[in-house]
């Protein structure tokens, strides 16, 4: 049997026998274009494609539409994989989204959505989510129905205020809504009473800025 040489996601890499977490090269669906991603092969059976990670504030997440489209940062540390790749990938098959969160008191929580996809750029990478379970709140901290993606230079939210400018970072802002995992990173002891921090309302409330976040996707039939 011929060995697979291109992979569209980390689940395919895992199934090929490469089961060590790390940076791998993925290929856009129906294309030869490549992108580097971090694959988590340990959490919940492995095969997760990490699409966002925050851990120390080393990367500026107040970026342009183009940068959020194409991705930025380092897959070994803080990064955003890229809306275009994620949109194309999740448009091909059914994916689940797992969001892992850490607070500054040593607690961890997660939200798992059993169906996740991003619409195309023509629809401002609108997020679609169903089937929430997990420990980070019984109500979704990503507004339902899903919002369009907004950045500092592309305001697609439902608030006159331009949420991305006010709250920092590109996100699926509503008006402005209960979450922003791409907000300003605040260190310990400076992480409360922040409007523009890393927020997941239905776990930690409105003014709390989280220590670490990871967003990862995997095919629903993995």
């Amino acid at each position: 049997k011929e060995e697979q040489t291109t992979f569209r996601d980390c689940a395919e890499i895992f199934k090929s026998g490469l089961t060590t977490s790390g940076i791998y090269t993925l290929t856009f669906p129906n294309s030869t274009e490549e992108i580097k991603a971090y694959c988590d092969m340990d959490v919940g059976g492995g095969g997760w494609t990490v699409i966002q990670h925050r851990e120390d504030g080393s990367v500026d997440f107040q970026r342009t539409w183009k940068e959020y489209k194409e991705g930025f940062g380092s897959p070994l540390g803080e990064y955003w994989l890229g809306n275009e790749f994620v949109s194309q990938l999740t448009g091909q098959h059914r994916y689940v989204l797992k969001i892992q969160l850490k607070d500054w008191e040593g607690n961890e929580a997660h939200s798992l959505y059993d169906h996740f996809y991003l619409a195309g750029e023509e629809s401002n990478y609108r997020i679609h989510l169903t089937g929430l379970t997990g420990t980070a709140g019984k109500i979704s901290s990503i507004s339902q129905p899903g919002s369009d993606f907004s950045t500092k230079d592309s305001d697609n939210d439902k608030c006159i205020c331009k949420c991305s400018q006010m709250l920092s970072g590109g996100w699926w802002f509503d008006a402005c809504g209960p979450s922003n995992l791409n907000g300003q990173y605040y260190p310990q002891k400076q992480n409360t009473n922040k409007f523009n921090g890393i927020k997941w309302y239905y776990w930690k409330g409105s003014g709390y800025s989280l220590k670490a976040t990871t967003m990862m996707i995997r095919p629903a039939d993995f």
Epitope: C159, I160, C161, K162, Q165, M166, A175, C176, G177, P178, N193, K194, F195, N196, K199, Y201, K204, G205, S206, G207, Y208
Partner: antibody, heavy 121, light 107 residues
Framework: QVQLVQSGAEVKKPGASVKVSCKAS????????MVWVRQAPGQGLEWMGY????????GYNQKFEGRVTMTTDTSTSTAYMELRSLRSDDTAVYYC??????????????WGQGTLVTVSS | DIQMTQSPSSVSASVGDRVTITCKAS??????VAWYQQKPGKAPKLLIY???TRDTGVPSRFSGSGSGTDFTLTISSLQPEDFATYYC?????????FGGGTKVEIK
């Protein structure tokens, strides 16, 4: 209609504590943050902090940290603000006010009638 | 904390006059500014939010403008019931802060 009704005027001695209540009606109490703002006689407005009735989360103005506690009783749709170690310069009208948004402490669209707290020996 | 400097501190005007009150923030607050009206012995009342959006039921003679650090409240034609004190309020960062107030008095 949406209403916030506060407890009556209080006279306290320096060093004492005061607890002001604010009963909400006409809306879902847990859907909006509540803030407390005070106004010394003839002076401007000063934000003291907020409480989120949905989860009990609070955020206080550093100026009052350690002296103020904000709580809610969701069964009676009532918010409380307790201020301890009172000084004469705490003499003020204390207002509760509702924020327009659950997720952020934006602007304040509904206000209580105010509670005058006088601190005097 | 962000300082909100309001001017003038008081203004004497007549019914029908156009009154302009300004508020300057010590740093950029985007458009996260509200304006309130307060009458003696009463609680403040929300007039304007997001710098220029009138709250429900607020007469059209009240208008707000500005962004960044400079904001204005304008009463286009002063009415008898408008004699009051007006406060600006920034809510772009903790703690939210208010201007010192502008008292609009009858000339």
């Amino acid at each position: 209609q949406v209403q916030l009704v506060q407890s009556g005027a209080e006279v306290k001695k320096p060093g004492a504590s005061v607890k002001v209540s604010c009963k909400a009606s006409g809306y879902s109490f847990t859907d909006y943050n509540m803030v407390w703002v005070r106004q010394a006689p003839g002076q401007g407005l000063e934000w003291m902090g907020y409480i989120d009735p949905y989860n009990g989360g609070t955020g206080y103005n550093q100026k009052f940290e350690g002296r103020v506690t904000m709580t809610t009783d969701t069964s009676t749709s009532t918010a409380y603000m307790e201020l301890r170690s009172l000084r004469s310069d705490d003499t003020a009208v204390y207002y509760c006010a509702r924020t327009r948004d659950r997720y952020d402490v934006w602007y304040f669209d509904v206000w209580g009638q105010g509670t005058l707290v006088t601190v005097s020996s | 904390d962000i300082q909100m400097t309001q001017s003038p501190s008081s203004v004497s005007a007549s019914v029908g006059d156009r009154v302009t009150i300004t508020c300057k923030a010590s740093q950029d607050v985007y458009i996260a500014v509200a304006w309130y009206q307060q009458k003696p012995g009463k609680a403040p009342k929300l007039l304007i939010y997001w710098a220029s959006t009138r709250d429900t039921g607020v007469p059209s003679r009240f208008s707000g403008s500005g962004s960044g650090t400079d904001f204005t409240l304008t009463i286009s034609s002063l009415q008898p019931e408008d004699f009051a004190t007006y406060y600006c309020h920034q809510y772009s960062s903790y703690p939210p802060t208010f201007g010192g107030g502008t008292k609009v008095e009858i000339k």
